[in-house]
């Protein structure tokens, strides 16, 4: 494959990153499936500037990002190292809160509409960013 | 029984607001969401937006973001709904619905659905000047 | 957002009558769609849940069926308790949005 220079048409390009920013809704799992399509992932946040760039794009609206705990601990789908990551809860969250008419807990992280982060039901049709590194390289075959 | 009442009949002047109330008993209020339903006279249904008091949660119908809040009191086990700005079409039968995920068993990978099934009797807004 | 049609607008039938609605989505929305009777006065009442699932308590004279952007309910056998209107909603993205209903009269 060849490295990616520029972002595919609608995604828009920042510090060397490409995020695209759905107009509908899908459960967690459906986004980030998606995403994997588009040879992509669900935003990892990894700064605070980060965070504002995402928040700016995403509006006063809930999205989900690529943070679940499905499997126990709190996982980056990209690997990013969450204990020593950038972090923006909440107060009082996350609570992987198992009280509501679920079988499991809140196990999706989404933006809410103040752009600080809340877990949630993973089957809430949220809005989602996809997120790929400019430097990486592309499944696409190189153009001869 | 799980039950939602609601507040009673309001009539208004074009411009003000309302605040419906919807008070749940027989289930434990923060596990699942209220949704709001209204219902113009001899007209469909319309669905406004959802609450969830777990996680303060709103999400709004576009029509109706701006001029509708949804709020509610844990302690009181009740939710809001208010409306701003009213005008004519805004006269309506408004219901809170309960709501959450449920899953079908069976499937793999599991699949979820969206219940609301327990409704409130329905409050009357008259927007008239 | 998702738009959903429903056909016919209204019907009349008779008691004993097998009768069928439609709904259809503007986009595919799989199996997340709810069928709701109403009648004059009274909040919705679920009859259908993901599609084709009956709700406890309900008779079995109700169905549903269809997935992605074609569904449909259908009343086996009418009865005098069943005059009312349906609606359709789907739950597969926000906002969640009805059918504009249809209601079923005594021919």
């Known amino acids: 494959g060849s490295e990616r220079t520029c972002c595919p048409v609608n995604w828009v390009e920042h510090e060397r990153s490409c995020y695209w920013f759905s107009r509908s809704g899908k459960a967690w799992a459906d986004a980030d499936n998606y995403c994997r399509l588009e040879d992509a992932h669900l935003v990892v946040v990894t700064s605070w500037e980060e965070q504002k760039f995402v928040q700016h794009h995403i509006g006063p609206v809930n999205t989900w990002m690529g943070l679940h705990d499905q499997n126990g601990p709190w996982k980056w789908v990209d690997g990013t190292d969450y204990e020593t990551g950038f972090k923006n809860w909440r107060p009082e969250q996350p609570d992987d809160w198992y009280g509501h008419g679920l079988g499991g807990g809140e196990d999706c992280a989404h933006f809410t509409d103040d752009g600080r982060w809340n877990d949630d039901v993973c089957q809430r049709p949220y809005r989602w960013v996809c997120e790929t590194e400019l430097d990486k390289a592309s499944q696409e075959p190189p153009l001869l | 029984q799980v039950q939602l009442v609601q507040s009673g009949a309001e009539v208004k002047k074009p411009g003000a607001s309302v605040k419906v109330s919807c008070k749940a008993s027989g289930y434990t209020f923060t596990s699942y969401d209220i949704n709001w339903v209204r219902q113009a006279t001899g007209q469909g249904l319309e669905w406004m937006g959802w609450?969830?008091?777990?996680?303060?949660?709103?999400g709004y119908a576009q029509k109706f973001q701006g001029r509708v809040t949804m709020t509610w009191n844990t302690s009181i086990r009740t939710a809001y709904m208010e409306l701003s700005s009213l005008r004519s079409e805004d006269t309506a039968v408004y219901y809170c619905?309960?709501?959450?995920?449920?899953?079908?068993?069976?499937?793999?990978?599991?699949?979820?659905?969206?219940?609301?099934?327990?409704w409130g009797q329905g409050t009357t807004v008259t927007v008239s000047s | 957002d998702i738009q959903m049609t429903q056909s016919p607008s209204s019907l009349s039938a008779s008691v004993g009558d097998r009768v069928t609605i439609t709904c259809r989505a503007s986009q595919g929305i799989r199996n997340d769609l709810g069928w709701y009777q109403q009648k004059p006065g009274k909040a919705p009442k679920r009859l259908i849940y993901a599609a084709s699932s009956l709700q406890s308590g309900v008779p079995s004279r109700f169905s549903g069926s269809g997935s992605g952007t074609e569904f449909t309910l259908t009343i086996s056998s009418l009865q005098p308790e069943d005059f009312a209107t349906y609606y359709c909603l789907q739950h597969n993205d926000y906002p969640f949005t009805f059918g504009p209903g249809t209601k079923v009269e005594i021919k």
């Open positions: 609450m969830n008091p777990n996680s303060g949660n709103t």
């Open positions: 619905a309960r709501g959450f995920y449920d899953f079908l068993t069976g499937y793999s990978p599991t699949y979820y659905y969206y219940d609301m099934d327990v």
